[in-house]
């Protein structure tokens, strides 16, 4: 028995920040779980972890240097990534493990979300074209 995960196929991070919502076919209320976001086709980089416990405050952390926050819904976890770099454009996968109460459950691998990071390009504005050559 596996949890199904739905993610947007693609998101664009215009201001080097993005909200990625992971929607699960499972109610996380009163469960102890570990939701995580992984970068790359091989999911090699664990970008962010949201640890939920029935008795404690939500714990959100990254051990890989990402600036992340997390928000919990009944059947979703939303990861808020900030300060993304253009070279972090990649495919990102949501993962969920429900530990308590048993039985342990995890998810079928999702299709992932391509996050396209558009950097802040310092282009001259048409109204303020900048200094012109004499």
């Amino acid at each position: 028995n596996k949890i199904l995960v739905k993610q947007s196929p693609m998101l664009v991070a215009y201001d080097n920040a993005v909200n990625l919502s992971c929607k699960y076919s499972y109610n996380l209320f009163s469960r102890e779980f570990r939701a995580s976001l992984h970068k790359g086709l091989d999911s090699a980089v664990e970008v962010c972890v949201v640890y939920g416990n029935y008795s404690q405050q939500l714990q959100v952390y990254s051990k890989t240097g990402f600036n992340c926050d997390g928000k919990l819904g009944n059947e979703s976890v939303t990861f808020y990534l900030q300060n993304l770099y253009v070279n972090q454009t990649d495919i990102y996968f949501c993962k969920i493990e429900v530990m308590y109460p048993p039985p342990y459950l995890d998810n079928e691998k999702s299709n992932g979300t391509i996050i396209h990071v558009k950097g802040k390009h310092l282009c001259p504005s048409p109204l303020f074209p900048g200094p012109s050559k004499p």
Epitope: E32, R34, M99, P102, Y104
Partner: antibody, heavy 120, light 111 residues
């Protein structure tokens, strides 16, 4: 046949660290459906759960020990490890590794245990 | 944390006696009709051995004289006819919540 064999116990100085090993055979530590925990038992006392590792590599710890303990594994050796830091006399115990299945989390197979004595 | 309290802490019994040990949890360990409460036997110098899982299911290879019952917060381990090899310490354990906790143990001694 499922087997768990602990090693690495012995005499350790207070303030020191220990690293115990648990070699598993008869099943794979990375196969979905089973996890392994470390459990300890002080001389003449009851059983205390230290923490668990799931097939995915996710770890869970007893909050009373969390700041001092790390559970890890080497899939190529099918071996589990327990690192415990800042040891004190009350950490003197027999340390067991035990397997559990994902249905009920009951510990169905146990190692023979390894004794750790913390003393100067 | 879920506290498990076993009673009695120790008991003396004779071969052939019916023995009952109780385990009370500080909160329910039931979830969707399953009780996440297990019983172990431990002999001196040996590792614990699983006897009963999920309150009443007999672990493979365990003699049928061992049985478990109960739900919610109150559980019982029964040995219908005590055998010489049954003199040991018995522990209950819950796996409903983390941290997983054990009862303090019940020592069954020869009368």
């Amino acid at each position: 046949e499922v087997q768990l064999v602990e090693s690495g116990g012995g005499l350790v100085q207070p303030g020191g660290s220990l690293r115990l090993s648990c070699a598993a055979s008869g099943f794979s530590l990375s196969t979905s459906g089973v996890g392994v925990s470390w459990i300890r038992q002080a001389p003449g006392k009851g059983l205390e759960w230290i923490g668990s590792i799931y097939h995915s590599g996710s770890t869970y710890y007893n909050p009373s020990l969390k700041s001092r303990v790390t559970i890890s594994r080497d899939n190529s050796k099918n071996t589990l490890y327990l690192q415990l830091n800042s040891l004190r006399a009350e950490d003197t115990a027999v340390y067991y590794c035990a397997r559990y299945e994902y249905d009920y989390y009951a510990f169905d197979y146990w190692g023979q245990g390894t004794l750790v004595t913390v003393s100067s | 944390d879920i506290q498990l309290t076993q009673s009695p802490s120790s008991l003396s019994a004779s071969v052939g006696d019916r023995v009952t040990i109780t385990c009370r949890a500080s909160q329910s360990v039931d979830f969707y009709g399953i009780s996440f409460l297990h019983w172990y036997q431990q002999k001196p110098g040996k590792a614990p051995k699983l006897l009963i899982y999920a309150a009443s299911s007999l672990q493979s290879g365990v003699p049928s004289r061992f049985s478990g019952s109960g739900s919610g917060t109150d559980f019982t381990l029964t040995i219908s006819s005590l055998q010489p090899e049954d003199f040991a310490t018995y522990y209950c354990q819950q796996s409903y919540r983390t941290p997983r906790t054990f009862g303090q143990g019940t020592k069954v001694e020869i009368k």
